[in-house]
């Protein structure tokens, strides 16, 4: 997977009046990395691993960037003409990626009340607008404003692309993101299903990077995909991921089943607990 930096900013309006402040989150390699603390008006790292990325450096630069972006987005929202009464939101998501072959991608997406209405490839400067008439109207509105704004020139988009990549490279240089391997905690639970059956669930949590194999085995042989149910691999808010896999088995056959986990070149197998209450949890 490519390395990525993703900025997610949201500004709000009430009855046509743009609210002060903004919401901002930054994700590094899909993990919550920074958020803007509105009380302290500062960018704050999300968890210890995020702090480790910058070491003892301050977060002034990040604070400055997010504040500037928030101000720009508030101005953009103020120029959206179709604001009716009530609460409305304008969200900007900007993503840049560095792929294994060192190629890069950058894009920017605008959402009004949660609906995508404008996207731009920051490298080619191509704009894309969804087909709906509402999206077309909003996109024209915002593009006209962006053209009027002297800051939003050709060089500005190049700068947005370059700045995002520069920040991403700076974070990667710390080595924390690249080197980091956090092994999963694996636990197996059982619950009653239909008569004569139980559902066994294997959960892996607090692991990094995201790639993991988690599967049920019967007598040491992997069960087919159609007999297992998988959860998505999701961030758990601590700079790590979590996922699960479940299957239904006959009561009394528990000893035949194990959960197999493989992560970052390591593996483990985990039996089904024999009692109803017992949960086997292990950190390999």
């Amino acid at each position: 997977e490519p390395h990525s930096l993703r900025y997610n900013l949201t500004v709000l309006s009430w009855d046509g009046s743009v609210q002060s402040g903004f919401l901002a989150e930054v994700h590094l390699d899909g993990q919550p990395f920074l958020r803007y603390d509105r009380q302290k008006c500062r960018a704050k790292p999300q968890g210890q691993w995020a702090e480790d990325v910058l070491g003892n450096k301050t977060w002034d630069r990040e604070t400055r960037d997010l504040t500037g972006n928030g101000k720009d987005l508030r101005m953009t929202l103020a120029h959206i003409k179709d604001q009716k009464e009530g609460l409305h939101s304008l969200q900007e998501i900007r993503v840049c990626e560095i792929h294994e072959d060192n190629s890069t991608r950058s894009s920017q997406h605008f959402y009004y009340d949660g609906e995508l209405f404008l996207s731009q490839n920051l490298e080619t400067e191509e704009w894309t607008v969804p087909q709906s008439s509402r999206a077309q109207t909003l996109a024209m509105n915002v593009r006209n404003f962006l053209k009027e704004d002297a800051m939003k020139t050709k060089t500005h988009y190049h700068a947005m692309h370059a700045d995002c990549l520069q920040e991403l490279r700076r974070y990667l240089e710390s080595g924390v993101v690249l080197r980091r391997t956090v092994p999963p905690m694996v636990n197996v639970t059982r619950s009653e299903a239909s008569e004569g059956n139980i559902t066994v669930t294997c959960r892996a949590s607090s692991f990094y990077p995201r790639n993991i194999i988690l599967t049920w085995r019967q007598d040491g042989v992997s069960l087919s995909h159609d007999t297992q149910q998988w959860g998505d691999v999701l961030p758990d808010g601590n700079g790590t991921y979590q996922t699960w896999v479940a299957t239904r088995i006959c009561r009394g056959e528990e000893q035949r089943f194990t959960c197999y986990m493989e992560h970052s070149g390591n593996h483990s197998t985990h039996p089904v607990p024999s009692g109803k209450v017992l949960v086997l949890q292990s950190h390999w």
Epitope: D219, G220, V221, S222, T269
Partner: antibody
Framework: QVQLVQSGAEVKKPGASVKVSCKAS????????FYWVRQAPGQGLEWIGY????????VYNQKFKGKATLTVDKSTSTAYMELRSLRSDDTAVYYC???????????WGQGTLVTVSS | DIQMTQSPSSLSASVGDRVTITCRAS??????LNWYQQTPGKAVKLLIY???RLHSGVPSRFSGSGSGTDYTLTISSLQPEDIATYFC?????????FGQGTKLEIK
């Protein structure tokens, strides 16, 4: 490639015990189960039991409970099967086998002949 | 225990012949059936798993079919190196049980 090398032939007296070894190479030892099977002279194959080498969990054929004990030594990538209270009808070739997680008994050892005779 | 009845117990065929060996289970084994080849002085080899899946490196002249209680191993064109004993294994229900074997000879 996956290789299972078993210990040499054994001759034992009735009532004695024997420990057959199965040394694995060519893959990560704790990844896959070990299965044990026997074939008495002129007879078919009989499954004895299996062991998960990661945590040592075992499942036995009821017929061999109390007769066979399966263990592993992770440090030497070796699986063991101990047979106790040997009788003449335990005379057989004993095989270890492992899997690739797609099928049971994917790879087999060459077999170990255990002869029980007074 | 599930009984696996394999037939024939021995058979003689010529090079190039199509050879069929069958295994019948005493109850439904849901396709959890493997076929193996045992040659004197060599390790046992897996040929087919889950009724019809060819194990890697096994020649395509070997194939498997069946469902429920009845399963078949077919060698489409017998080769001299196929002379061996063949047996089936059911892996659906514990204890795992094997067929008695079919000894294949060249005419």
């Amino acid at each position: 490639q996956v290789q299972l090398v078993q210990s040499g032939a054994e001759v034992k007296k009735p009532g004695a015990s024997v420990k057959v070894s199965c040394k694995a190479s060519g893959y990560a030892f704790t990844k896959y189960n070990f299965y044990w099977v026997r074939q008495a002279p002129g007879q078919g194959l009989e499954w004895i039991g299996y062991i998960d080498p990661y945590f040592g969990g075992t499942v036995y054929n009821q017929k061999f409970k109390g007769k066979a004990t399966l263990t592993v030594d992770k440090s030497t990538s070796t699986a063991y099967m101990e047979l106790r209270s040997l009788r003449s009808d335990d005379t057989a070739v004993y095989y270890c086998a492992t899997t690739d997680a797609y099928s049971l008994f994917t790879y087999w050892g060459q077999g170990t002949l255990v002869t029980v005779s007074s | 225990d599930i009984q696996m009845t394999q037939s024939p117990s021995s058979l003689s065929a010529s090079v190039g012949d199509r050879v069929t060996i069958t295994c019948r289970a005493s109850q439904d084994i849901s396709n959890y059936l493997n076929w193996y080849q045992q040659t004197p002085g060599k390790a046992v080899k897996l040929l087919i798993y889950y009724t019809s899946r060819l194990h890697s490196g096994v020649p395509s002249r070997f194939s498997g079919s069946g469902s429920g209680t009845d399963y078949t191993l077919t060698i489409s064109s017998l080769q001299p190196e196929d002379i061996a004993t063949y047996f089936c294994l059911q892996g659906n229900t514990l204890p795992f049980t094997f067929g008695q074997g079919t000894k294949l000879e060249i005419k």
